[in-house]
């Protein structure tokens, strides 16, 4: 009769992830290993799994040398993959005979797989005492919450280790625009995005650019997670009296100024730098449906 060297272990995994179950059996002759599955619903029946099942999300790798070893992997997990996975082993030569009854029972080892789905998050944006408060509330969680994280534009704004099903964040009134993310920890528990409207948030590549006479300078302004998206970029050069002279694309092919803009970025290229004309403070102006924001870049030109 066959016996198990290694039985599959019960596991919890997040939806979208994968699970791997491992089973090893000994016997003489070397036993065959099969994988079976039974769902958690009352009327779910037991069905055999094969390599390529469930739209090629199920893969089975087996090795039969001194003993039998088999690994079952399920990718792209969904709630329907929750259930009991059974490793069956038999050394009976007649185990698969269509008419002759098996002489020895299949031995079985079971593992429970629970596919955890992120909870549903309700979000709200409220004005409280002239401050903007963002709230995320999780309906339920299959695992213990160990904290919360708030992010914007890839930066962590706030983090805690509270076990609550809700979390709040107060937005900086002068710097509100952008897509905020609330994350319930451990990370797959739940995540939601909240778009907060406001004037553009922009940053410059470098506060100060240095170039030499005759060369070119590239001045760059970038959107920093602005919402709504930036629709217009303008460039100015300020005189010593603060007068702002608009800079537009030169019409001639080898023109002095070239401005290339996307909602995410604007670049002003100044060619053939003149030490008497081009040094100074340049202003990039970004506009969206909520307003206008500007940033400055200082250009210094060294004479040859």
């Amino acid at each position: 009769a066959a016996g198990f060297l290694k039985a599959p272990l019960s596991q919890e995994r997040w939806a979208g992830g994968s699970v791997v179950l491992h089973c090893e059996a000994v016997g003489s002759p070397i036993p065959e290993i099969q994988w079976w599955f039974e769902g958690n619903a009352p009327n779910d029946s037991c069905s055999q799994l094969w390599d390529g099942a469930r739209l090629d999300r199920v893969h089975i790798h087996a090795a039969y040398r001194q003993h039998a070893a088999s690994s079952l992997s399920v990718d792209g997990l969904t709630a329907e993959d929750t259930g009991t996975y059974e490793c069956r082993a038999s050394s009976d030569p007649d185990r698969n005979h269509l008419t002759r009854p098996p002489r020895v029972k299949w031995v079985r080892a079971q593992a429970s797989v629970v596919v955890l789905e992120p909870g549903t998050i309700q979000t709200s944006v409220q004005e409280v005492n002239s401050k903007t408060q963002l709230t995320c509330s999780l309906n339920s969680s299959g695992v213990d919450i160990v904290g919360h994280r708030w992010m914007r534009g890839g930066k962590v704004l706030q983090e805690d280790t509270l076990p609550d099903l809700h979390t709040k964040y107060i937005v900086d009134a002068d710097d509100r625009s952008g897509e905020y993310s609330c994350i319930f920890l451990p990370e797959p528990v739940g995540r939601s995005e909240i778009n907060v409207e406001g004037p553009p948030r922009i940053k410059v590549g470098k506060k100060s650019e240095h170039s030499s006479e005759g060369e070119l300078a590239k001045l760059v302004c970038k959107s920093d997670a602005s919402y709504p998206p930036i629709t217009d970029w303008f460039w100015f050069k300020t005189s010593d009296t603060g007068e702002e002279e608009a800079i537009t694309n030169s019409t001639e092919a080898n023109g002095k100024y070239v401005v290339v803009s996307t909602p995410e970025k604007s670049q002003l290229t100044i060619s053939n730098l003149d030490v008497n004309v081009d040094p100074g403070t340049y202003v990039c102006n970004a506009t969206n449906a909520q307003g206008t924001t500007r940033e400055t870049i200082s250009l210094r030109v060294r004479s040859r």
Partner: antibody, heavy 116, light 106 residues
Framework: EVQLVESGGGLVLPGRSMKLSCAAS????????MAWVRQAPTKGLEWVAS????????YYRDSVMGRFTISRDDAKSTLHLQMDNLRSEDTATYYC?????????WGQGVMVTVSS | EIVLTQSPATMPASPGEKVTLTCRAS?????IYWYQQKSGTSPKLWIY???KLASGVPNRFSGSGSGTSYSLTISSMETEDTATYYC?????????FGSGTKLEIK
């Protein structure tokens, strides 16, 4: 909403000093030139001093050069005007203004009276 | 120093009347700027870049000119337009204002 609020005015003796401050809000202070403009009682407007973005360059009218110092604190969005060796002709309402070649926003003004 | 000369110093006008205030510069400038100041209040930017109306300025106001000669025009005078109007240049230091035109209601 752009706001410029001046403080620090009052009565001062000739030859003494006084410092005016201006708290700015509602715009990205560090990206604008700033200035002070004054108006003597029943007289016209007179530019006093201005300061560049970053504060590297300052400009003054001849009559205050060497006596007045304009400065800015971008971290606090505040503009200052240090006035030393004050004269009776410096008596005026002093306005903090945002400068773009023209003065697009004005504070409410602060009265400085130089008198013995 | 660029000197700005405003004329007239005082101008009485009747409601509905067309009014033109002038500002002459001692040397050529690119733009002129106009401000309105009512008694006891801070000046307000009224017209910038010679002809652009500042936010909230009624469209009965207009500005024009070039070089050394500039003007502010009110197509139809209203009581609320009673104020002193100053022109200013931002071309070079020292920044200078005209001496102002006091616009009064007849």
């Amino acid at each position: 909403e752009v706001q410029l609020v001046e403080s620090g005015g009052g009565l001062v003796l000739p030859g003494r000093s006084m410092k005016l401050s201006c708290a700015a809000s509602g715009f990205t202070f560090r990206t604008y030139y700033m200035a002070w403009v004054r108006q003597a009682p029943t007289k016209g407007l007179e530019w006093v001093a201005s300061i560049s973005i970053g504060g590297d360059n300052t400009y003054y009218r001849d009559s205050v050069m060497g006596r007045f110092t304009i400065s800015r604190d971008d971290a606090k969005s505040t503009l200052h005007l240090q006035m030393d060796n004050l004269r009776s002709e410096d008596t005026a309402t002093y306005y903090c203004v945002r400068l773009r070649g023209y003065f697009d926003y004005w504070g409410q003004g602060v009265m400085v009276t130089v008198s013995s | 120093e660029i000197v700005l000369t405003q004329s007239p110093a005082t101008m009485p006008a009747s409601p509905g009347e067309k009014v033109t205030l002038t500002c002459r510069a001692s040397s050529s400038i690119r733009y002129i700027y106009w401000y309105q100041q009512k008694s006891g209040t801070s000046p307000k930017l009224w017209i910038y870049d010679t002809s652009k109306l500042a936010s909230g300025v009624p469209n009965r106001f207009s500005g024009s000119g070039s070089g050394t000669s500039y003007s502010l025009t009110i197509s139809s005078m209203e009581t609320e337009d009673t104020a002193t109007y100053y022109c200013q240049q931002g071309r070079s230091y020292p920044l200078t204002f005209g001496s102002g035109t006091k616009l009064e209601i007849k």
